[in-house]
Amino acid sequence: IWELKKDVYVVELDWYPDAPGEMVVLTCDTPEEDGITWTLDQSSEVLGSGKTLTIQVKEFGDAGQYTCHKGGEVLSHSLLLLHKKEDGIWSTDILKDQKEPKNKTFLRCEAKNYSGRFTCWWLTTISTDLTFSVKSSRGSSDPQGVTCGAATLSAERVRGDNKEYEYSVECQEDSACPAAEESLPIEVMVDAVHKLKYENYTSSFFIRDIIKPDPPKNLQLKPLKNSRQVEVSWEYPDTWSTPHSYFSLTFCVQVQGKSKREKKDRVFTDKTSATVICRKNASISVRAQDRYYSSSWSEWASVPCS
Amino acid sequence: RAVPGGSSPAWTQCQQLSQKLCTLAWSAHPLVGHMDLREEGDEETTNDVPHIQCGDGCDPQGLRDNSQFCLQRIHQGLIFYEKLLGSDIFTGEPSLLPDSPVGQLHASLLGLSQLLQPEGHHWETQQIPSLSPSQPWQRLLLRFKILRSLQAFVAVAARVFAHGAATLSP
């Protein structure tokens, strides 16, 4: 058993049929010695008396808010949550496996630049009685500070018969060094509580590996005289790290016909302009990637050819 | 020559070679199914790598103030990786494919390190016993780890030379 926060405790249980469970001793936080009784949740049934209460925690029916009273007055509470371990593996019932970029990916994180700011998100089908708490650090043995905000519900989607809820959190490294080569990964830890079930999820990454620039901005076409060619120009996204002479991007320019089956013409360039042939009813799209490190491409910025 | 001891480096030459290094490092080890090599733990095999850290003067302001400190650090890393790529980690079994970019990568590391030969002091690397795994599968894993680490290192070096070529060239 360990303390998650004040008056909230997590009992770690090996979860299999007829498991013996865990013996837990609760102590009433009071100077009083006599006339103390214990109850669980909203029930008025007295579970025991005395300053301590010993219980055998085996299942969710044994978890909940234990309260000690004296003469109708509440003295203190202890909330017991369960963390299930099945076949040596901690349960992951609360969050959905996003399966990208690999199986057992529950947390996904992205950064728009090298400032040390990043966003993580996760999915669940649970809509109520759900709380999240997020902690992060750079490295684990001698951790350096990363400050995370509160997790918030950022999107709701309907998937077949189910509703899916996306939660996200923003974090900022306290003493970020954008130009340095990271040698210690960022660690992100999410505590999830659904009713009386506790689970924790972790992710470990370098900022460089989760970079995904915003799409290029101000995408414009300039027709060239007496030609089917056009000059496409764009700018670095505002959110990208500066100076651009140091934090450089490379770009992919694509000409795509109306039909998805039509052949795509692609040009790669380090410049912020390119000359392409604009076909009727086609569109021109540009996306960006770090020039020197192959992290994710941005989403496409697009304009119609006409 | 780009000398991290006094005179100004050949920024444009260094920029071209460092950008080539980035391309080679990624073609030598593309992201194969997102292998998470950090899960293997950071044992003694790769932990004496000269990382470009915050105080090394490789940020735009540090380069403007005095680029020599950063160039010395980059030089350290280049000779470290050059030694690793020439060691039995890469020359031993399993043999690299004949068209593997590792040979080119090794030569380019050497080329850039010679461009950056520092004045005033000299760095060398020593092969440490723990850097020579006996099993081919260990060697393969170590190659991946070294190449992933090299990708991060040359990315910073390339940014430094690109910025230098754009803003610090005479």
Epitope: - | D48, Q72, R73, F80, G120, W123, Q126, Q127, S130, L131
Partner: nanobody, 125 residues
């Protein structure tokens, strides 16, 4: 905080040898780069040699390369500087220093955190 104590200095004739030791206490140095620097009267402190945490990387100033050898024994929390073929221009106070931010140290004295009190080396002609 790391405390460093140098020893082994003294008066020696040109062409002679000395072995300097630097014993660290208060913190294990096995994860940090270590360096030797020297300062002659009226001159700036200058880099002599440095060694990485696991001895994989070693640096020497051009003026001592081939004559001096830096080494370390992490089990003993000690760094050594073997000085051979000493010259009068090697006369200086020799300082040991720890780069507590790096496994692979630099040649920049300002990057080193822990410094010893120094040991005097005098080479007579």
């Amino acid at each position: 905080e790391v405390q460093l104590v140098e020893s082994g200095g003294g008066l020696v004739q040109a062409g002679g040898s000395l072995r300097l030791s630097c014993a660290a206490s208060g913190r294990t140095i096995s994860n940090y780069g270590m360096g030797w620097f020297r300062q002659a009267p009226g001159k700036e402190r200058e880099f002599v040699a440095a060694i990485s945490a696991r001895s994989a990387m070693i640096g020497y100033s051009d003026s001592v390369k081939g004559r001096f050898t830096i080494s370390r024994d992490n089990a003993k929390n000690t760094v050594y500087l073997q000085m051979n073929s000493l010259k009068p221009e090697d006369t200086a106070v020799y300082y040991c220093a720890a780069d507590l931010n790096r496994r692979v140290p630099t040649a920049r004295p300002q990057e080193y955190d822990g410094w010893g009190q120094g040991t005097q080396v005098t080479v007579s002609s």
